[in-house]
């Protein structure tokens, strides 16, 4: 059964390569998927000596660590690329790194968007 | 290290009941799914179950649908599989495994067998 | 109802190639359906192999690698050795919470 599940349509969209990948470079993304998959979406970052290099935010297709995850939280120790996934719209524009040895808390706030 | 140390397992005649657990240590359990993989004396090996972070979704292959109820306890790092109405064929040894991102198990226990007969 | 097939039984010179496959009734296999491949020896629990297709596990030898073969997920073994003498087991991701065991291959090393 999936109980408590949050349906998820649309993610934040990020991608660092976006020159290379001829993609754009940020926005929203609705997500689309096989029918009875779940839908999920995804945050993956660096971090360099304390400094966040953003590296892909989107869409992520049904994975079952994902389910009932409603905030993107990395928990691996010291990983190469951070990566987070969670379930409803837009739950990847906050994301955290809470590693299991205990160490602190960190949330990476999104940039507040320039009034217009 | 990631351990899992199933429990619970033995003898136990058709249509009775037992409850397995499996102990979990070495990592946050409760940031990871988890599942439940059973294999037959001589066969190979079977999904039986899986449960969410939370616990808030569970699954069940179509076999063992309304006779067994995962459950988790994040507070006890401990994963339950509750089976009722057991049959000779749930006879098998049952491995708790730990999932990890794109849906695989990367951490399986050693088992616990199972044995369903009168 | 999925049934995941694979080959019931393989054998490979040692030192040579082999390529196990993992197929299903209901289409192709593709990366979506998270390909995992396990090992298992008598009276041991599973060992995992590769995961999401290609990823080695850690600590899992270069000799072994995951592909997709056609429709079908793969892994192939170079340079057997008689310890791979084994159960191979594939794994597919159904979504929805369901994954599907292929029926296993046994390895043997001659």
């Known amino acids: 059964s999936g109980r408590g599940e949050a349906e998820t349509r649309e993610c934040i969209y990020y991608n660092a390569n976006w020159e290379l990948e001829r993609t754009n470079q940020s926005g929203l993304e609705r997500c689309e998927g096989e029918q009875d998959k779940r839908l999920h979406c995804y945050a993956s970052w660096r971090n360099s000596s304390g400094t966040i290099e953003l590296v892909k935010k989107g869409c992520w297709l049904d994975d079952f660590n994902c389910y009932d995850r409603q905030e993107c939280v990395a928990t691996e120790e010291n990983p190469q690329v951070y990566f987070c996934c969670c379930e409803g719209n837009f739950c990847n524009e906050r994301f955290t790194h809470l590693p299991e040895a205990g160490g602190p808390e960190v949330t990476y706030e999104p940039p507040p968007t320039a009034p217009t | 290290e990631v351990q899992l140390l199933e429990s619970g397992g033995g003898l136990v005649q058709p249509g009775g009941s037992l409850r397995l657990s499996c102990a979990a240590s070495?990592?946050?359990?409760?940031?990871?799914?988890m599942a439940w993989v059973r294999q037959a004396p001589g066969k190979g090996l079977e999904w039986v179950s899986g449960?969410?972070?939370?616990?808030?979704?569970?699954f069940y292959t179509d076999s063992v649908k309304g006779r067994f109820t995962v459950s988790r306890d994040n507070s006890r790092n401990t994963l339950y599989l509750q089976m009722n109405s057991l049959r000779a064929e749930d006879t098998a040894v049952y491995y708790c495994?730990?999932?990890?991102?794109?849906?695989?198990?990367?951490?399986w226990g050693q088992g616990t067998l199972v044995t369903v007969s009168s | 109802q999925t049934v995941v097939t694979q080959e019931p039984s393989f054998s490979v010179s040692p030192g040579g190639t082999v390529t196990l496959t993992c197929g299903f009734n209901?289409?192709?296999?593709?990366?979506?359906?998270?390909p995992s491949w396990y090992q298992q020896t008598p009276g041991q629990a599973p060992r995992t192999l590769i995961y999401n297709t290609n990823t080695r596990s850690s600590g899992v030898p270069d000799r072994f690698s995951g592909s997709i073969l056609g429709n079908k997920a793969a892994l192939t073994i170079t340079g057997a050795q008689a310890d791979d003498e084994s159960d191979y087991y594939c794994v597919l991701w159904m979504g929805s919470g369901i994954w599907v065991f292929g029926g296993g291959t046994k390895l043997t090393v001659l």
């Open positions: 495994a730990k999932v990890y991102y794109t849906s695989f198990f990367d951490y």
């Open positions: 209901s289409g192709s296999v593709s990366t979506s359906y998270y």
């Open positions: 449960i969410s972070v939370t616990g808030g979704s569970t």
């Open positions: 070495g990592f946050t359990f409760r940031n990871y799914a």
